[in-house]
Interface confidence: low
């Protein structure tokens, strides 16, 4: 028996295309629309549950609904990693898993989903109003994050399927090329739709068997971007016994290769020093956000002007690719 909560889905209306377009004419728009939706708006889902047998034990499950290659997953407590959250675990598909108290067990469930068990007793247990966030760094989609917490009722046994809640990172420098193509396609699609808008015809009902008919996930690009931009992060605020800080992992995380901006994530700071040349210099904690590597902290006097990267035990090959992805 367990208590579960999921972040609410951003459910778009099903697109109804007006106009008397023939089936052939529809193929391109539907393909473009599919591209705009599936490639342009990957999603992250978060599921938080409290074990009824052990009320101080939480399980967080997160997954990435996208076609890209995941290069890093960060689970944080208390809000998004870049906005005050503190890291509980970092999972890298090749370089291993690091976790901190009160995280007990972090693991990959599938190639695109992870789970994390948090333990605690008394003062050190996570509270039901704690927000847990999962951030997926992937290529070519970039960084996507979603957050969730337990519902106010916290009734053991409450269960629902996990639902996606995307966050748009509009400044992903590493995917400008892909974005440009998609943007062009989306604009072209809108142009086609507008051109045929005033032609009277019955509303199109996409065929269930048609590969060009994405249903639940097919939402217009404008809706997608607006919804994502207007939701800085999806979270449910709940209440329970007074929250404790004993569950926090300090300032966000480990000294992993190219990881997350932790130092700047918890205090208002000046802009991070950005470096675009992936040259390993010394171990440090840097960001893969936006396809660039951000040095997360002051550079010691002996460190050169190059990028501060974690020296990967597997050698220089580990640093290939825009996000360390080969």
């Amino acid at each position: 028996m367990r208590t579960e909560a999921q972040v609410p889905a951003l459910q778009p209306p099903e697109p109804g295309l007006e106009g008397a377009m023939g089936h052939r004419t529809l193929v391109l728009p539907w393909v473009l629309l599919t591209l705009c939706v599936t490639a342009g708006t990957p999603e992250v889902w978060v599921q938080v549950r409290m074990e009824a047998t052990e009320l101080s034990s939480f399980t967080i499950r997160c997954g990435f609904l996208g076609s890209g290659s995941i290069s890093l997953v960060t689970v944080s407590w208390g809000g998004p990693n870049g906005a005050g959250g503190t890291t509980l675990a970092v999972l890298h598909p090749e370089r291993g898993i690091r976790q901190w108290a009160p995280a007990r067990q972090a693991r990959w469930e599938t190639q695109s989903s992870i789970s994390l068990i948090l333990e605690g007793s008394g003062a050190s247990s996570p509270c039901a109003n704690t927000t847990f966030c999962c951030k997926f760094a992937s290529f070519p989609e970039g960084s996507w994050e979603a957050c969730g917490s337990l519902p106010p009722s916290s009734d053991p046994g409450l269960s629902a399927p996990p639902t996606p809640a995307p966050i748009l990172r509009a400044d992903l420098a590493g995917i400008l090329g892909v974005s440009g193509v998609l943007l062009f396609g989306c604009v072209y699609l809108l142009h086609l739709l507008r051109r045929h808008k005033h032609r009277p015809a019955p509303r199109l009902q996409p065929s269930r068997t048609s590969p060009q008919a994405p249903r639940a996930r097919a939402w217009a690009p404008s809706q997608a971007s607006q919804a994502a931009l207007h939701v800085p992060y999806a979270t449910i605020n709940t209440s329970c016994r007074p929250a404790t800080l004993d569950t926090a992992h300090p300032h966000g995380g480990p000294s992993w290769w190219a990881s997350l901006p932790t130092h700047a994530a918890h205090r208002p700071q000046g802009p991070a020093a950005w470096a675009s040349t992936p040259i390993p210099a010394r171990g440090s904690f840097v960001s893969v956000e936006n396809g660039l590597y951000a040095q997360a902290g002051e550079r010691p006097p002996h460190t050169g002007p190059g990028l501060t990267l974690f020296p990967d035990p597997r050698g220089p090959r580990a640093m290939e690719g825009p996000l360390g992805v080969r």
């Epitope: 503190t86 108290a101 800080l245 918890h266």
Partner: antibody, heavy 119, light 107 residues
Framework: EVQLQQSGPELVKPGASVRISCKAS????????MHWVKQSHGKSLEWIGY????????GHNQNFKSKATLTVDKSSSTAYMEFRSLTSDDSAVYYC????????????WGQGTSVTVSS | DIQMTQSPASLSASVGETVTITCRTS??????LSWYQQKQGKSPQLLVY???TLTENVPSRFSGSGSGTQFSLKINSLQPEDFGSYYC?????????FGGGTKLEIK
């Protein structure tokens, strides 16, 4: 210059509690973990736990979870460790150590506080 | 918890010699390992972090190597000030643990 100044030696009775302080200077106190380490006479080092001054978040070695309480006073840039229910096994030198925010290293250590538990 | 096995427990060497201290971990800790030097009655001093990165102002005769579960600290051309105790420590998540230490004495 980064400095961690610990409180002086303590002689306490079994069953009592002791509170050790570690005053930090020369850096932004809330930006770094503060760790506590125990060293019994002639023995190795034992990690007790850490506190992150920015939000009070802590992590403990389970062996010390019921024994040590870690707190900070941000206004004075001071970290505290309270040790309770002391026994002769708790007689040791206790160090505070700053850990850089990338979790790479404990780069600065206090001079140590000697605690002797004796009746 | 990750166990740290440091060897040898004690070591006698002469000035000018080269010595190597090893540290083995029970689990893969990648390169999340530090080496400390401690003199009698003093606090530990960080020598090496991330397995092989030398701390500022530490002489280049010290060098760290290894990854995964096997690590070593090498001291070339021992100097009188190098004698003392050495400890390895992992920082691959909590709880951090230290090795049992190596006491380096003058022969």
């Amino acid at each position: 210059e980064v400095q961690l100044q610990q409180s002086g030696p303590e002689l306490v009775k079994p069953g009592a509690s002791v509170r050790i302080s570690c005053k930090a200077s020369g850096y932004t106190f809330t930006d770094y973990n503060m760790h506590w380490v125990k060293q019994s006479h002639g023995k190795s080092l034992e990690w007790i736990g850490y506190i992150y001054p920015y939000n009070g978040g802590t992590g403990h070695n389970q062996n010390f979870k019921s024994k040590a309480t870690l707190t900070v006073d941000k206004s004075s840039s001071t970290a505290y460790m309270e040790f309770r229910s002391l026994t002769s096994d708790d007689s040791a030198v206790y160090y505070c150590a700053r850990e850089d925010f990338r979790h790479e290293k404990m780069d600065y250590w206090g001079q140590g506080t000697s605690v002797t538990v004796s009746s | 918890d990750i166990q740290m096995t440091q060897s040898p427990a004690s070591l006698s060497a002469s000035v000018g010699e080269t010595v190597t201290i090893t540290c083995r971990t029970s689990d893969n800790i990648y390169v999340y390992l530090s080496w400390y030097q401690q003199k009698q009655g003093k606090s530990p001093q960080l020598l090496v972090y991330n397995a092989k990165t030398l701390t500022e102002n530490v002489p280049s005769r010290f060098s760290g190597s290894g990854s995964g579960t096997q690590f070593s600290l090498k001291i070339n051309s021992l100097q009188p000030e190098d004698f003392g105790s050495y400890y390895c420590q992992h920082h691959y998540g909590t709880p951090y643990t230290f090795g049992g230490g190596t006491k380096l004495e003058i022969k």
